[in-house]
């Protein structure tokens, strides 16, 4: 039995940031799971991992340098990516593994989401100094 995953076919990161929602045919509430996002046709780069342990706080990390966060819905995990680079334009695949309770479940490979990163359009001008932080 495999979990089905739905993703948007394409997203554009206009300001080097994007939110990618992974929708599952499975309710993750009160489950121990590992949701991850993978980059490339071969899914070779694990972009971000969101680890959920029942109703506790999500643990988020990246072994590959991506700035990411995650939000949990009953049947979804949304990955928030910041500081993306133009050369990270690629196809991204959602993956889900449910560790507990048994049986172990994972997903059928999804169609993926093409994330097109459009860099910040910087137009420096002496008349308009940079923004200020509070």
């Amino acid at each position: 039995n495999k979990i089905l995953v739905k993703q948007s076919p394409m997203l554009v990161a206009y300001d080097n940031a994007v939110n990618l929602s992974c929708k599952y045919s499975y309710n993750l509430f009160s489950r121990e799971f590992r949701a991850s996002l993978h980059k490339g046709l071969d899914s070779a780069v694990e972009v971000c991992v969101v680890y959920g342990n029942y109703s506790q706080q999500l643990q988020v990390y990246s072994k590959t340098g991506f700035n990411c966060d995650g939000k949990l819905g009953n049947e979804s995990v949304t990955f928030y990516l910041q500081n993306l680079y133009v050369n990270q334009t690629d196809i991204y695949f959602c993956k889900i593994e449910v560790m507990y309770p048994p049986p172990y479940l994972d997903n059928e490979k999804s169609n993926g989401t093409i994330i097109h990163v459009k860099g910040k359009h910087l137009c420096p001008s002496p008349l308009f100094p940079g923004p200020s932080k509070p």
Epitope: Q57, L58, F66, N67, C68, D69, Q82, N83, K133, P134
Partner: antibody, heavy 120, light 107 residues
Framework: EVQLVETGGGLVQPGESLRLSCAAS????????MHWVRQAPGKGLVWISR????????SSADSVRGRFTISRDNAKNTLYLQMNSLRAEDTAVYYC?????????????WGQGTLVTVSS | EIVLTQSPATLSLSPGERATLSCRAS??????LAWYQQKPGQAPRLLIY???NRATGIPARFSGSGSGTDFTLTISSLEPEDFAVYYC?????????FGQGTKVEIK
């Protein structure tokens, strides 16, 4: 005026636990990511943990993952760091810091720090 | 993780002189680089964010430049209160990392 005040530091033995607190005021605490950054005596700054604005997600550096847990109570405007299985190399001044939602890891405001000493 | 290397480790200058501090990243961090000032016994203070933007209340004598892997903090004319340790920090790649610091001391 933004204020962050850390408390809870002290002298503990290796293997023991400690909980640090950071009381926040002067801003909308529940709208900001919060962080812990530490500085060993005479050394540089090292980011160790963060929590998002509603406390639903967290990340930690490899050096503390599995031992330290960050949490927050938005009703009390307080950030916490639960430190378990402490080691001598955890000896440092621990700072809490604030970032905003558009720049997750840019540390706009800092507390004055609290010293944690791990020694037998 | 990205390693930030600051140079020099110590800079000995007199008030009124120009200070130039360098920060080099082990790989590109785009413009996601910040500078902090830390005085003895105090917390760090954000000076510059995103390479060249001054934080609120930071005097115009502080400026930042660079992109990719090479960055510079310049203090155009040192004031007595500027003698401190300066750290660069990147947020372009996770986890965020700091340089080891440059101490600006009175000559």
């Amino acid at each position: 005026e933004v204020q962050l005040v850390e408390t809870g530091g002290g002298l503990v033995q290796p293997g023991e636990s400690l909980r640090l607190s950071c009381a926040a005021s002067g801003f909308s605490f529940s709208s900001n990511w919060m962080h812990w950054v530490r500085q060993a005596p005479g050394k540089g700054l090292v980011w160790i943990s963060r929590i998002n604005s509603d406390g639903s997600s967290a990340s930690s550096a490899d050096s503390v993952r599995g031992r330290f847990t960050i949490s927050r109570d938005n009703a009390k405007n307080t950030l916490y760091l639960q430190m378990n299985s402490l080691r001598a190399e955890d000896t440092a001044v621990y700072y809490c810091a604030r970032s905003d939602s558009s720049s997750w890891y840019e540390f706009e405001y800092w507390g004055q720090g609290t010293l944690v000493t791990v020694s037998s | 993780e990205i390693v930030l290397t600051q140079s020099p480790a110590t800079l000995s200058l007199s008030p009124g002189e120009r200070a130039t501090l360098s920060c080099r990243a082990s790989q590109s961090v785009s413009n996601y680089l910040a500078w902090y000032q830390q005085k003895p016994g105090q917390a760090p203070r954000l000076l510059i964010y995103d390479t060249s933007n001054r934080a609120t209340g930071i005097p115009a004598r502080f400026s930042g430049s660079g992109s990719g892997t090479d960055f510079t903090l310049t203090i155009s004319s040192l004031e007595p209160e500027d003698f401190a340790v300066y750290y660069c920090q990147q947020r372009g790649n996770w986890p965020p990392t700091f340089g080891q610091g440059t101490k600006v001391e009175i000559k």
